[in-house]
Every structure is written in structure tokens, then in C-alpha cells.
């Protein structure tokens, strides 16, 4: 798998998208996780509603979100709040069984805030030592919610 | 109607090639996962692998691996189990299964099933 | 791999009986199960999937039960057409691992 990156304002929301085959995944949970190493297990850090049918519904664990569009075939994370330590290596994953298929490796950046006059130093990017070979870079444009805005719609 | 149906049966000598099939109809073929199942005469089922005739994506049984290659054309709604040398004890019923993903659990099982391939090497 | 056993490996009953036969995995694997009835010169036909739900058109006198590494199948009252072997299945992980097969025969 190519990896993709995307790129996002600290503080702000990054939103990811991870697009699949809705026929080859159809009835298939879906898991977003968090790359430990190179080689090593990827964390789950939030899986879609356990009942596939429900996978439309937004789940949040923390300050991650995710909700799938079954019939589209589209994965949605999103990340509120970026922060510099969620900069890393992660995994759109389809689970069938207790395995799971990676439907896209991604790499999150995070951007210091311009209007953010703070030390920049702790903001992560991959170092010269690290490749990531025909990384695809995707810009997510996002931006804070606003004050009294409810991050997700409220049930009727 | 759902209907997977396979190729007749072969008698082969050892080390002779061999490509068996399996035609699916009534169904969106393409849409679907098939694997291949290997029963031995008188003994139990055997999972060998898995494709998806959409992309052609491949799963195989370590136990299977570089045995045989398991490949699909969906333009004809068929997916193929073939070898490039037959030994004896390949001689077995070979049977293509539909997988299919059931949502409630979101794991998939093998709800069609092929009439079987019957294999018989011998020299 | 997963192993999965099955017991007994044969069993007689006769018509109108309730006969049980058990799935143990080696390890868990939730309740990712399914339960085939093979005929003699047939292909395998699914009876149950996900531990306890009857695929379209089975009877109601077949239901699965358990979860984690033990599994039952029961038919609450044999009919004539059931004497078969039966083979459980484990969906859990690749490769898809299949119990030894019990087999039913007339008492």
C-alpha cells in the first residue's frame, strides 16, 4: 500500500477519507488504528457501529471520530483538536473475523497555527530518515467549530 | 438462482498441469468473494484460498501457497484452481464455494456451493 | 491456524430424536462459527452462521448455540433427510478451518 498524507492545522480539525470497493467490504465493520513502529501492531484507536447497518452513525472515541458511507464505499476520520502528538503513521482498516484488510495507509502531519506565534518545535514531520515512496499528499482543508456549534448533528 | 457450477472430473498422471473451473450465475459475480475447498476421499474440508473476481485480490492457506493458483475472469463470471504438476496426492474432490459476508457479524461464510471436481491423479 | 474439534465423530439416533453435536476451537474466536450438512457424492449445504443464526430455508428444528471455543449444534427432532455428516466451520481468521466432520447414521 502507498501511503497518503494528509495535513493539518494544530488545533484545528483534519479530516481523512479513505475510499473502497462498497461491493469487496460490503457487511464489513470498519476501523481506523495507530501505527506502533515500523513492524510493529496497529493500535485500534476507533472502530465504525457494531451493527454494519449503523455504520452511517458518527463514533467518537476521544477527540477521533468515524462514520461510513456503506454504499459509496467512503471511510471518514476525523481528528478535532490536532495536536502535535497525533502526528503519525495510521491505518483506514475493513475488519472480517478478527482480521482486518488495511484500506489505506496514511501518514498526519500536523502544521503549526500562523496565527499560533508559539514555539514550533514540537510539531512533527518525518525525519530525512524516514521514506514514505510515492506518498500522496492530500491538504484537508478544516477549520475550528465554532463556538456553540455541535460537532455532530443532534437525533430528532 | 444462485448456481455455481464446476468443470467435470479429470484423471491425470503425476506431473501433468491442470486448470479446473467454476461458473457462477444468477449473481453479481464479481461482487462476491470464491474460494476453493480440497476434500480428500473419505476424510474432511480443506479452505485453500479465496478471490475476489472484482480486482483479482488473492488470499491463499499457507498450507496452499505455491501449490496451486487460485485466479478468476469475471468478463465470464468464472474462477479457476489450476497446477502446474499433479502429484497423487492431490487426487481429491475439489469443491468452489460462494463467501459471503453476513452484516450481522461482519464475518463471511460459504453460503453456495459447487457440485465438486473430482481429481484423480494416478500414474 | 485455528484447530477445531468436533465430537462425537459419529453418532446413531433414530427418527424423532434429539441429538447434539459439539465444536471445540483452540482458541476463541467469539461467535464466528457455521455449520454445514454434507450428503454423501453432495457439496457441503450452510445450516447455521455467526454461532446461532439459520440461513434462509433451514429448518427450525436446526439451531447453534455458544461462543468463545464451545459450540453446539442441535436438531431438536431428526428427520429422515438429516442423516448426513455435519462439519463446523470457524470464520475467526485465515485459514478458515473446518472441524472433522460427525457423522449420523440410522440406529
Known amino acids: 500500500h502507498n501511503t497518503t498524507v494528509f495535513q493539518g492545522v494544530a488545533g484545528q480539525s483534519l479530516q481523512v477519507s479513505c475510499p473502497y470497493d462498497s461491493m469487496k467490504h460490503w457487511g464489513r465493520r470498519k476501523a481506523w488504528c495507530r501505527q506502533l513502529g515500523e513492524k510493529g501492531p496497529c493500535q485500534r484507536v476507533v472502530s465504525t457501529h457494531n451493527l454494519w447497518l449503523l455504520s452511517f452513525l458518527r463514533r467518537w472515541n476521544g477527540s477521533t471520530a468515524i462514520t461510513d458511507d456503506t454504499l459509496g464505499g467512503t471511510l471518514t476520520i476525523t481528528l478535532r483538536n490536532l495536536q502535535p502528538h497525533d502526528a503519525g503513521l495510521y491505518q483506514c482498516q475493513s475488519l472480517h473475523g478478527s482480521e482486518a484488510d488495511t484500506l489505506r495507509k496514511v501518514l498526519v502531519e500536523v502544521l503549526a497555527d500562523p496565527l499560533d506565534h508559539r514555539d514550533a518545535g514540537d510539531l512533527w514531520f518525518p525525519g530525512e530518515s524516514e521514506s514514505f515512496e510515492d506518498a500522496h499528499v492530500e491538504h484537508s482543508i478544516s477549520r475550528s467549530l465554532l463556538e456553540g456549534e455541535i460537532p455532530f448533528p443532534p437525533t430528532s | 438462482e444462485v448456481q455455481l457450477v464446476q468443470s467435470g472430473a479429470e484423471v491425470k498422471k503425476p506431473g501433468e498441469s491442470l486448470k479446473i473451473s467454476c461458473k457462477g450465475s444468477?449473481?453479481?459475480?464479481?461482487?462476491?468473494?470464491i474460494a476453493w475447498v480440497r476434500q480428500m476421499p473419505g476424510k474432511g474440508l480443506e479452505w485453500m484460498g479465496i478471490?475476489?473476481?472484482?480486482?483479482?485480490?488473492?488470499r491463499y492457506s499457507p498450507s496452499f501457497q505455491g501449490q496451486v493458483t487460485i485466479s478468476a475472469d469475471k468478463s465470464i463470471s468464472t474462477a479457476y484452481l489450476q497446477w502446474s504438476s499433479l502429484k497423487a496426492s492431490d487426487t481429491a474432490m475439489y469443491f468452489c464455494?460462494?463467501?459471503?459476508?453476513?452484516?450481522?457479524?461482519?464475518?463471511?461464510?460459504?453460503?453456495?456451493w459447487g457440485q465438486g471436481t473430482l481429481v484423480t491423479v494416478s500414474s | 491456524d485455528i484447530q477445531m474439534t468436533q465430537s462425537p465423530s459419529s453418532v446413531s439416533a433414530s427418527v424423532g430424536d434429539r441429538v447434539t453435536i459439539t465444536c471445540r476451537a483452540s482458541?476463541?474466536?467469539?461467535?464466528?462459527l457455521a455449520w454445514y450438512q454434507q450428503k454423501p457424492g453432495k457439496a457441503p449445504k450452510l445450516l447455521i452462521y455467526?454461532?446461532?443464526s439459520r440461513q434462509n430455508g433451514v429448518p427450525s428444528r436446526f439451531s447453534g448455540s455458544g461462543s468463545g471455543t464451545d459450540f453446539t449444534l442441535t436438531i431438536s427432532s431428526l428427520q429422515p433427510e438429516d442423516f448426513a455428516t455435519y462439519f463446523c466451520?470457524?470464520?475467526?481468521?485465515?485459514?478458515?478451518?473446518f472441524g472433522q466432520g460427525t457423522k449420523l447414521e440410522i440406529k
Open positions: 464455494a460462494r463467501s459471503r459476508t453476513f452484516y450481522y457479524d461482519s464475518s463471511d461464510y460459504f453460503d453456495y
Open positions: 444468477g449473481y453479481s459475480f464479481g461482487s462476491y468473494w
Open positions: 478471490i475476489y473476481p472484482g480486482d483479482s485480490d488473492t
Open positions: 482458541q476463541g474466536i467469539s461467535s464466528w
Open positions: 455467526a454461532a446461532s
Open positions: 466451520q470457524q470464520a475467526d481468521s485465515s485459514p478458515r478451518t
